[in-house]
């Protein structure tokens, strides 16, 4: 088999026939050096999954539940291409599983016990697996058989396809539990009708069900959605209030050597020639000899899944939690109201050591998880491997796009009411050596630049955003002659000045000596022409305040700031000479952990915060000898956000817009993956 062949896995005679037709028609339109199709027939989707893992086939299209199976060891498959529905302009690759209730019913998600429930059908995704999976640990024991536990949880249900003899309560609202449209409460529309008729108190359906059944907005306004955080939202706010976001139908391949680019090339060309309304003789999204053969008949085309996206991220934390609960059936010993330990994400060895020290001192309240980059940490928080970390505003933006929420803000000024008063922010500045007297904001081209890291606020988003507005392109590595911007591509001129050794060169963590505020300033001191840092960086590292050999003899007076009007000013005049105001660093977490992270961190800062006077004899949370480990070293306290509890509200409209403009220059693979899930 030539290397450019994609071996498609078919699960029935009809699929195999369509696959052969697909193969033959592709041959007729694609040059001989292009991708081609071969067909492999297996007895089931699980056999296809195993065949792909064993390198006997390359691709198959799966429903969400099977994507989960495909991801589990030893299969280790990943999503590579998604089918989309709707229009090319507004492609839908996911649907949302929701819990719909009547507006005046007054209960929340955590008060469903004893209510009457309407389900699309036993074993179906939105109607059963997701809601029951998420409620699993609230079900009365024994939880097996599951139907019995569910019957004892709700006071009555309609769960079409259930066994009405063994579990009559599941058929109480729809006598007989018929498994077809003959049952008026079967399927999405049926489950909604069950709610509408007043038979049930809650209907588990998908987000589009209510729109398909109620054309009139006034009618829709009589209903609400139950959110996982025990609030309610209007039915059109399903993106912010759902049980899970579920991919509709996805092509999977091996994680390693999986031919994902070839599969995309093949399917992209296939949709060009044989997609919706393209060809009479062969149609990719049509099944004359059956239904949904190889691809869903309702699909309109394909989208490439971003490479950073593994199955866990693609399926989402809620969906994975629900399915894992159902499959593994494990719950914590009697659930308590007490918070579990918060798993803090630490970057590289330096942060991990400080985190471990915190963990020991916290007496079991904090545990530590390691990752190599900030984006890896954010991904771990998203999928539940970690719970929280403190982030620069640029990463608060990425975390927010990935569904995380800010929970507390670092405050840098001493005040009587520190914890209750989140600050307006700090200043992003451009620092130069006083001796380079001809250097201004207007003649930085060809100079050597020092950045905290790619994607961070003061070191990248603000200066590069301003620069982009001037030069109208993203080739910043051509604008500066060389520099150190940790997180840049290793062969970029923006890694040339960096000092990390071997694989650590230009890495966006403390293994790179020029990483972060202190690192970028050190880069200026030793090699660079300009450093993009925060307004406190120079005073914090001069006048003997940083004892490291490179810094101990530095004098603040030897440095100046570049102002946007082309002038220069002394370092202490940052309030009148800065690039922009930056939002303070903030702690982020998943929505489901928000309350516990808030509670535990408030306790921890009372024990180890800036009220500790002697850091040589005690653990201090906000100290790490100018290395900004876990938190910025100038943090005075972690402050409540009050109503600024989403990333947009926290960062502010101006900053969100500025980062949004820079998106076209973004190299963030995580941001690309998260905007695929939520454009």
């Amino acid at each position: 088999v030539p290397d450019k062949t994609v071996r498609w896995c078919a699960v029935s005679e009809h699929e195999a026939t369509k696959c052969q037709s697909f193969r033959d028609h592709m041959k007729s339109v694609i040059p001989s050096d292009g991708p081609s199709v071969a067909c492999v027939k297996k007895a089931s989707y699980l056999d296809c999954i195993r065949a792909i893992a064993a390198n006997e086939a390359d691709a198959v299209t799966l429903d969400a539940g099977l994507v989960y199976d495909a991801y589990l060891a030893p299969n280790n498959l990943k999503p590579v291409v998604a089918e989309f529905y709707g229009s090319k302009e507004d492609p839908q690759t996911f649907y949302y599983a929701v819990a719909v209730v009547k507006k005046d019913s007054g209960f929340q998600m955590n008060q469903l016990r004893g209510k009457k429930s309407c389900h699309t059908g036993l074993g179906r995704s939105a109607g059963w697996n997701i809601p029951i999976g998420l409620l699993y640990c609230d079900l009365p024991e024994p939880r097996k058989p599951l139907e019995k536990a569910v019957a004892n949880f709700f006071s009555g249900s309609c769960a079409p396809c259930a066994d009405g003899t063994d579990f009559p309560q599941l058929c109480q609202l729809c006598p007989g539990c018929g498994c077809s449209t003959l049952n008026q409460y079967f399927g999405y529309s049926g489950a909604f009708k069950c709610l509408k008729d007043g038979a049930g108190d809650v209907a588990f359906v998908k987000h589009s069900t209510i729109f398909e059944n109620l054309a009139n907005k006034a009618d829709r306004d009589q209903y609400e959605l139950l959110c996982l955080d025990n609030t309610r939202k209007p039915v059109d706010e399903y993106k912010d209030c759902h049980l899970a976001q579920v991919p509709s139908h996805t092509v999977v391949a091996r994680s390693m050597g999986g031919k994902e680019d070839l599969i995309w090339e093949l399917l992209n060309q296939a949709q060009e020639h044989f997609g919706k309304d393209k060809s009479k003789e062969f149609q990719l999204f049509s099944s004359p000899h059956g239904k949904d053969l190889l691809f869903k008949d309702s699909a309109h085309g394909f989208l490439k899944v971003p490479p950073r996206m593994d199955a866990k991220m693609y399926l989402g934390y809620e969906y994975v939690t629900a399915i894992r609960n159902l499959r593994e059936g494990t719950c914590p010993e009697a659930p308590t109201d007490e918070c579990k330990p918060v798993k803090w994400c630490a970057l590289s060895h330096h942060e991990r050591l400080k985190c471990d020290e915190w963990s020991v001192n916290s007496v079991g309240k904090i545990e530590c998880v390691s990752a190599e980059t900030t984006e890896d940490c954010i991904a771990k928080i998203m999928n539940g491997e970690a719970d929280a970390m403190s982030l620069d505003g640029g990463f608060v933006y990425i975390a927010g796009k990935c569904g995380l929420v800010p929970v507390l803000a670092e405050n840098y000024n001493k005040s009587d009411n520190c914890e209750d008063t989140p600050e307006a922010g700090y200043f992003a500045i451009a620092v130069v050596k006083k001796s380079a007297s001809d250097l201004t904001w207007d003649n930085l081209k060809g100079k050597k630049s020092c950045h905290t890291a790619v994607g961070r606020t003061a070191g990248w988003n603000i200066p590069m955003g301003l620069l982009y507005n001037k030069i109208n392109h993203c080739r910043f590595d051509e604008f500066f002659s060389e520099g150190c911007a940790p997180g840049s591509k290793k062969d970029s001129s923006l890694c040339k000045l960096c000092m990390g050794s071997g694989l650590n060169l230009c890495e966006p963590n403390n293994k790179e000596g020029y990483y972060g505020y202190t690192g970028a300033f050190r880069c200026l001191v030793e090699k660079g022409d300009v450093a993009f840092v925060k307004h406190q960086t120079v005073p914090q590292n001069t006048g003997g305040k940083n004892p490291d050999p490179w810094a101990k003899n530095l004098n603040e007076k030897d440095y100046e700031l570049l102002c946007l009007d082309g002038t220069r000013k002394p370092v202490e005049e940052y309030a009148n000479c800065h690039l922009a105001r930056a939002p303070n660093h903030a702690v982020v977490t998943r929505k489901d952990k928000e309350a516990c992270v808030h509670k535990i961190l408030r306790q921890q800062q009372h024990l180890f915060g800036s009220n500790v006077t002697d850091c040589s004899g005690n653990f201090c949370l906000f100290r790490s000898e100018t290395k900004d480990l876990l938190f910025r070293d100038d943090t005075v306290c972690l402050a409540k956000l009050h109503d600024r509890n989403t990333y947009e509200k926290y960062l502010g409209e101006e900053y969100v817009k500025a980062v949004g403009n820079l998106r076209k220059c973004s190299t963030s693979s995580l941001l690309e993956a998260c905007t695929f899930r939520r454009p």
Partner: nanobody, 112 residues
Framework: QVQLVESGGGLVQAGGSLRLSCVAS????????VIWYRQAPGKQRELVAL???????NYRESVKGRFTISRDDAKNTVWLQMNALEPEDTGVYYC??????FGQGTQVTVSS
């Protein structure tokens, strides 16, 4: 009240070894983990190694591969085995567990 007593320090040539011990009086010692710190003259106290109740260990970068921390809960003791000692390892070594004040420490001097 639990007290910590460190011992095992001394004068040793570069490349040599020492085994420090930290013994606790009282019960419940190290239930949340034990940390060895050191302080060189005129410098900040720095973390050297730690061991948690589940046996997890971690070390500062400069001692990794040379030092090993271990514990024996039955003996209420934590050890720090130090091999391939370097002059930069000189200082007073202290062990610490949450809620218990620092002890006197034990002096380690490595001559070149």
């Amino acid at each position: 009240q639990v007290q910590l007593v460190e011992s095992g320090g001394g004068l040793v040539q570069a490349g040599g070894s020492l085994r420090l011990s930290c013994v606790a009086s009282g019960s419940g010692f190290g239930i949340n983990g034990v940390i060895w710190y050191r302080q060189a003259p005129g410098k900040q106290r720095e973390l050297v190694a730690l061991i948690k109740s589940d046996g997890y260990t971690n070390y500062r970068e400069s001692v990794k591969g040379r030092f090993t921390i271990s514990r024996d809960d039955a003996k209420n003791t934590v050890w720090l085995q130090m091999n391939a000692l370097e002059p930069e390892d000189t200082g007073v070594y202290y062990c610490k567990t949450p809620g218990v004040p620092f002890g006197q420490g034990t002096q380690v001097t490595v001559s070149s």
